[in-house]
């Protein structure tokens, strides 16, 4: 059977995006988010 | 085509104050989300601060706030970067964005318009 592991050497980078509350609606303010391999998270 | 172009840079003082100009031609002003960007020598271009489309909200990196302030006029198609308290680290090319509307304001790839940059250096 194969095997799978999780060490196979990518790392996954996030990093802290912010918006405009304006962009999505008619708030204001900023609105921070997380992208983690490339999915905004938060 | 959207057109960027900044003015205002120059030498100064360490603890004086600057301010850059951002003309903005060829597009519709109002459509625009706007950011300033700093590239120091030998150092990546870093994000320095943005400012919404109506102008009513902004965002600074931590290492200018309080310092920074951005602001737009819409009658004159034209951003503002008010710079105080300038420090030598503050030394560097500093270049104005444009981005579309819905899109991360501090990271350099949402921008899709950018000026030519206008040199700022503080001296001690």
């Known amino acids: 059977d194969a095997e799978f592991r999780h060490d196979s050497g990518y790392e996954v980078h996030h990093q802290k995006l912010v918006f405009f509350a304006e962009d999505v609606g008619s708030n204001k303010g900023a609105i921070i988010g997380l992208m983690v391999g490339g999915v905004v998270i938060a | 085509q959207v057109k960027l172009e900044e003015s205002g840079g120059g030498l100064v003082q360490a603890g004086g104050s600057l301010r850059l100009s951002c003309a903005v031609s060829g597009g519709t002003f109002s459509s625009i989300g706007m950011g300033w960007f700093r590239q120091a020598p030998g150092k990546e271009r870093e994000f320095v601060g943005a400012?919404?489309?109506?102008?009513?909200?902004?965002y600074y990196a931590d290492s200018v706030k309080g310092r920074f302030t951005i602001s737009r006029d819409g009658a004159k198609n034209t951003v503002y970067l008010q710079m105080n308290s300038l420090k030598d680290e503050d030394t560097a090319v500093y270049y104005c964005a444009g981005r579309p509307a819905g899109t991360a304001i501090n990271i350099r790839r949402s921008y899709n318009y950018w000026g030519q940059g206008t040199q700022v250096t503080v001296s001690s």
């Open positions: 400012i919404s489309r109506s102008g009513d909200s902004t």
